[in-house]
Structures are given as structure tokens and as C-alpha cells.
């Protein structure tokens, strides 16, 4: 039975050229996390497997960094980075938990909603 819940940073915004941390947290379960996939619509950005560690898509290697923890740091943001991001937690024995984050990359400095998760 799946008892856990995924908490995410929710809807966030950041400035063009800046950085942001996409973060999900699995709570209320003792299940072991075997793998986390970070996906953006139809693309696999990164995968973190408990045995293999992190693998980042070459298309994003220059702008994506693993962590902190099981989160993902996006750098040198562009307006094209606006959209939905999904953290998919594969766990044993519970199964799969999915969290959704919507990121809006803004041209100007009106990114106050994402400030808590931005990297100076």
C-alpha cells in the first residue's frame, strides 16, 4: 500500500539567466528510493539510480547539475525552460510517486515566487 506523499516546490518563477533548484521530497513512507527520474514534458533530463548514481542528458549537461540531494539545479535559464517538470520517485516496495513543478522563466526581475529556491 502506498502511504507516502510527494511535496514539491510547486509553481515557481525565476529570472532569465539565473538558476533554480527543482526539489521534491518524499515523506510519510519508509520505502527505499531506488531511482528518481527528472523529466520535462517529453524529455528525460536526468536520472539518479541508487546503485548507479546520477546521469544527466548530454543535451542539458552544461546547464543542469545534480542535487542538492535528489533535486536538480537548472542554470543559465532561458524563456524556453518555462514549463512542467516532473520528479518520478521509484520506490521499493511502494511503487512510483510523481511530483509536478511548474517553472516560469521571466524576462524581468519579477521572480519573487521562486526566490526561496534560487541560487544567488
Amino acid at each position: 500500500m502506498m502511504t507516502g506523499t510527494i511535496e514539491t516546490t510547486g509553481n515557481i518563477s525565476a529570472e532569465k539567466g539565473g538558476s533554480i533548484i527543482l526539489q521534491c521530497h518524499l515523506s510519510s513512507t519508509t520505502a527505499q528510493v531506488t531511482q528518481v527520474n527528472w523529466e520535462q514534458q517529453d524529455q528525460l533530463l536526468a536520472i539518479c539510480n541508487a546503485d548507479l548514481g546520477w546521469h544527466i542528458s548530454p543535451s542539458f549537461k552544461d546547464r543542469v547539475a545534480p542535487g542538492p540531494g535528489l533535486g536538480l539545479t537548472l542554470q543559465s535559464l532561458t524563456v524556453n525552460d518555462t514549463g512542467e517538470y516532473f520528479c518520478i520517485y521509484h520506490t521499493y516496495p511502494d511503487g512510483t510517486y510523481t511530483g509536478r513543478i511548474f517553472l516560469e522563466v521571466l524576462e524581468s526581475s519579477v521572480a519573487e515566487h521562486g526566490a526561496r529556491f534560487q541560487i544567488p
Epitope: T34, Q35, E39, L44, N49, A50, P93
Partner: nanobody, 117 residues
């Protein structure tokens, strides 16, 4: 116990192609990720490609554009199509899978690929 069995390796000339297969046998369950790796003599194991249960893929820079990973979920089989092979692709090729009902990754026994010049 789930086992992974690779096949399709062999000797090929530079510029040629090979298609590797990796089949899961035994009490198989759904998988969340299957991938290909290789290890050349005296070198560390190298990541090549991963495919998720949602058919999303991720490649190493060294093989992107030359190698293609695909999967047949119904057969619990993953493939690696290797084109434009080079002598430096010579290695033992391994597949690995993360099954839903497993704490750890499962590895195959490997298949030898030799590319002659």
C-alpha cells in the same frame, strides 16, 4: 531470481553495425529503467545509454548519434543498435535493469564486442 542475458556480440569490422539484445528471464516484473554499459580491458565501466519505462532515453556523449537504445516492454527486452563502430568500441557490453520489485540493480553477464580495423 531475475536474470539478464545479453546476446548479439561478436567480431565486426570498423564502420560496421551490431545489434545487442538483453532479455530478462525468470520471474520478471515491470522495470523502471534498463541500460547498457561497457568495460574495455584495463578501463572502468562506462555508461552508454538508458531507457525508462516511459520510453524516454538518455545517452553518453561518446555514443550519441551512433548508438540507439530501444525496448520491447512486452518481452522485457532491451536493445542497443550500434552503428559506425570503431576499434575503440571494443569491450564487454553489459546490460542492467532496475525492476520495480527489487532493491538493487540487476546486471547481465556481458557480451564481447570486438571491432577490428
Amino acid at each position: 531470481e531475475v536474470q539478464l542475458v545479453e546476446s548479439g556480440g561478436g567480431l565486426v569490422q570498423a564502420g560496421g553495425s551490431l545489434r545487442l539484445s538483453c532479455a530478462a528471464s525468470g520471474p520478471t516484473f515491470s522495470w523502471t529503467m534498463m541500460g547498457w554499459f561497457r568495460q574495455a580491458p584495463g578501463k572502468e565501466r562506462e555508461f552508454l545509454a538508458i531507457i525508462t519505462d516511459g520510453s524516454k532515453t538518455l545517452y553518453a556523449d561518446s555514443v550519441k548519434g551512433r548508438f540507439t537504445i530501444s525496448a520491447d516492454n512486452a518481452k522485457n527486452t532491451v536493445y542497443l543498435q550500434m552503428n559506425s563502430l570503431k576499434p575503440e568500441d571494443t569491450a564487454v557490453y553489459y546490460c542492467a535493469a532496475q525492476f520495480t520489485l527489487a532493491r538493487h540493480l540487476v546486471w547481465g553477464q556481458g557480451t564481447q564486442v570486438t571491432v577490428s580495423s
